[in-house]
Interface confidence: low
């Protein structure tokens, strides 16, 4: 059974004689008269298992002590740390020539963990061990132990395990502890990459290249690599990992952003507090949710505040000029926190009797500089119909308006265009023709452009070619022209008048009066 003792993280202990409970039971040769297992107590009443030999009076000593089989656990080079006391021969009377102040350290590789005997010729010498002046004093109750520590290494090893042996050639020694260990570069996290426990190489100068794996919630930026040096120290970190979105580096880990914070990308940045008008309700947020009524445009960075649509434009002023309207307005009181505000114009043509019955103005209306996406706060609208009710809406929009089309974003004005001369009359008909008269009727102009005050009928004999014509005026859309000559061709033109003036005459209508005293009823443009 092995008790727990604390050693450096880069050392893996294969054997520690101080941690063994009970007797060590190593093999000695000769069985008696050489190395002997002796227990002493330290100042904490803890038994120390030692092996001692002190045959300094007798010549030609060759006392061997062999450990149990030690597994190498994949290590290619192992280290042997020996703590021992060694008597100064000068302090022992009458031992000149037979007393030695060194012992020899050997090893033997073997796959057999049950070898019962020491075969000296199988062992390979590691070194001769001598006491030096660098000792530590260990209190063992009523005595002070001058404890030397020597470390040797051996390798490369290839078999499953090995035995160590100590050869005494006539010294006075107490082996207080024997510890066998190998070195590893311990599991570590560097640059957010985890590097596993790595056993050092076979040579004291070798470097083992190790690829790291990114810690949880991180990803490779550059391939993380390090080199495990022979002394169990990690060297030359290359590459790194970055915490994923929603995570930041804290204590060598990628930890989730706390509530109210976020991180949008895999970078080495820390989590940032949610921008204004946004929040996160879970840990590990990659973006923050906008507050109710606030939005983030598609091309807005996650770091930008959430914004909202603008309020309505202010102070809309209209200026009507015949069939054109100039509109001007002021910027909204609240731009929603955005710079990308623009304006759209909606034009509706509304009935005079019922303003609620409005229809889009259609493509015949023109806008200067443009109808949508206006960056200025004025627009000129032309090619409107005269004497018509129009409602114009100015909509303030920004990059988030599409997410919340809100009626209070617009301001409207209703105007009536000025009256204009009417358009020409499209259809004039001769309804009844007699020898001396023609009854005419016609349609209202397509575009009255105002209130029709009267119609003017101009007629003349065809042969006269308008050199001598007569005028008849009427408020109705029909009239009887009397006092005509029989069997004569007449040409009729009709035009309408509004407060703004006369429109163009209609196309000519040619009618020939009858020769017989009867009526001809006609509805064509030309009656003969």
């Amino acid at each position: 059974v092995t008790g727990s003792r604390v050693y450096p993280a880069n050392e893996v202990t294969l054997l520690d004689s101080r941690s063994v409970q009970g007797e060590l039971g190593w093999i000695a040769s000769p069985l008696e008269g050489g190395w002997e297992e002796v227990s002493i107590m330290d100042e904490k009443n803890t038994p120390i298992r030692t092996y001692q030999v002190c045959n300094v009076m007798e010549p030609s000593q060759n006392n061997w002590l062999r450990t149990d089989w030690i597994t190498r656990e994949g290590a290619q080079r192992v280290y042997i740390e020996i703590k021992f006391t060694l008597r100064d021969c000068n302090s022992l009377p009458g031992v000149m020539g037979t007393c030695k102040e060194t012992f020899n350290l050997y090893y033997y590789e073997s796959d057999n963990d049950k070898e019962r005997f020491i075969r000296e010729n199988q062992f390979v010498k590691i070194d001769t061990i001598a006491a030096d002046e660098s000792f530590t004093q260990v209190d063992i109750g009523d005595r002070i132990m001058k404890l030397n520590t020597e470390i040797r290494d051996v390798g490369p090893l290839s078999k499953k395990g090995f035995y160590l042996a100590f050869q005494d050639v006539g010294a006075c020694i107490a082996l207080v502890s024997v510890r066998v260990f190998y070195k590893k570069c311990p599991l570590t996290v560097r640059n957010l990459a985890q590097f596993p426990d790595t056993i050092t190489g076979a040579d004291t100068s070798s470097l083992v290249e190790v690829r790291g794996s990114c810690v949880n919630n991180s990803e490779e930026k550059d391939v993380p690599k390090m080199y495990c040096g022979a002394d169990g120290e990690w060297l030359v970190p290359i590459g790194n990992c970055l915490c994923n979105a929603g995570h930041e580096e804290r204590s060598g880990e990628c930890q989730a952003c706390k509530i109210g914070y976020y991180k949008a990308l895999s970078t080495d940045a820390t989590c940032a507090k949610c921008p204004p008008h946004s929040y996160s309700v879970w840990e590990g947020a990659t973006s923050c949710t906008c507050d109710r009524g606030f939005f983030r445009a598609d091309n807005d960075a996650a770091s930008m505040p959430c914004t909202r649509p603008p309020s309505a434009p202010l102070n809309l002023i209209s200026n009507v000029n015949e069939t054109s309207v100039n509109l001007e307005w002021s910027s909204p009181q609240n731009t929603g926190g955005r710079q990308d505000i623009s304006y759209n114009v909606v034009c509706k043509k509304c009935g005079a009797g019922d303003p609620s019955k409005c229809r889009p103005c259609g493509s015949g209306v023109h806008y200067t500089p443009q109808q949508n996406g206006l960056k200025t706060t004025k627009v000129s609208i032309t090619d409107l119909l005269a004497h018509t009710n129009y409602t114009f809406e100015i909509w303030a929009v920004n990059g988030v308006s599409k997410y919340n089309p809100n009626p209070d974003q617009s301001v409207s004005v209703t105007v009536t265009t000025n009256q204009a001369a009417p358009s020409s009359i499209a259809l004039v008909q001769a309804k009844e023709v007699t020898r001396y008269s023609v009854a005419l009727a016609w349609l209202e102009p397509d575009r009255p452009n105002g209130v029709i005050l009267e119609y003017e009928v101009k007629y003349y004999e065809k042969d006269q070619n308008e050199r001598s014509y007569r005028i008849v005026r009427t408020a109705a859309r029909n009239t009887d022209i009397k006092g005509l000559n029989p069997l004569t061709s007449y040409v009729f033109h009709v035009r309408a008048r509004t407060a703004a003036g006369y429109g163009d005459f209609s196309e000519p209508l040619e009618v020939t009066t009858n020769t017989v005293p009867s009526r001809i009823i006609g509805d064509g443009a030309n009656s003969t």
Epitope: K258, I259, G260, Y279
Partner: antibody, heavy 124, light 107 residues
Framework: QIQLVQSGSELKKPGASVKVSCKAS????????MHWVRQAPGQGLKWMGW????????TYADDFKGRFVFSLDTSVSTAYLQISSLKAEDTAVYYC?????????????????WGQGTTVTVSS | EIVMTQSPATLSVSPGERATLSCRAS??????LAWYQQKPGQSPRLLIY???NLADGIPARFSGSGSGTEYTLTISSLQSEDFAVYYC?????????FGQGTKVEIK
């Protein structure tokens, strides 16, 4: 130093309302949520619920839904507990206690600072 | 809801003696447990959090142990100021319920 100071004792008639205040000092008010705990005479402690000091959103334990309202005035770092339609069984000491709103290291929760308690007595 | 059961209801101990208080949860609360001390007329005081962690300023004679559903508060050598009522409370899913308390009184 960090402390939660509650308003003084109240004696009310059944059917009345009472509003208990809990003023925080010595720390950032919005970094800690505020919880309310009731202790009826000679009885143990009962968690009533809490209010998020950043958002003002309250959470009520099932037994305290309806007549109990948690509110805040962050400008004066104060949390309030209002009880309406008081009943004799509402007679108790009411404590406020704080818990970190955000967790930086340990994810374990605990009430590290308590108010001194407010006694509400309901009697006709 | 999770029911917290403390035992014993009353513990009579002489000063200098060891006191062991138990708290059982009706289901695994994964060490999400705090212990509080309350003296008459005072508000509760945090002693232990996360089942085993000693709160700031609390003497080392107080210790907490346990996991799963069974938890213990130990006072290694009772002092006169330790006689009070002790409550356990879980934080594993709301509502956060308290135990009914253990009164530690002078024997």
């Amino acid at each position: 130093q960090i402390q939660l100071v509650q308003s003084g004792s109240e004696l009310k008639k059944p059917g009345a309302s009472v509003k208990v205040s809990c003023k925080a000092s010595g720390y950032t008010f919005t970094d800690y949520s505020m919880h309310w705990v009731r202790q009826a005479p000679g009885q143990g402690l009962k968690w009533m619920g809490w209010i998020n000091t950043e958002t003002g959103e309250p959470t009520y334990a099932d037994d305290f839904k309806g007549r109990f309202v948690f509110s805040l005035d962050t400008s004066v770092s104060t949390a309030y507990l209002q009880i309406s339609s008081l009943k004799a069984e509402d007679t108790a000491v009411y404590y406020c206690a704080r818990i970190p709103l955000y967790y930086y290291g340990s994810r374990y929760w605990y009430f590290d600072v308590w108010g001194q308690g407010t006694t509400v007595t309901v009697s006709s | 809801e999770i029911v917290m059961t403390q035992s014993p209801a009353t513990l009579s101990v002489s000063p200098g003696e060891r006191a062991t208080l138990s708290c059982r949860a009706s289901e695994n609360i994964y060490r999400n447990l705090a212990w509080y001390q309350q003296k008459p007329g005072q508000s509760p005081r945090l002693l232990i959090y996360a089942a085993t962690n000693l709160a700031d300023g609390i003497p080392a004679r107080f210790s907490g142990s346990g996991s799963g559903t069974e938890y213990t508060l130990t006072i290694s050598s009772l002092q006169s100021e330790d006689f009070a009522v002790y409550y356990c409370q879980h934080f594993w899913g709301t509502p956060w319920t308290f135990g009914q308390g253990t009164k530690v009184e002078i024997k």
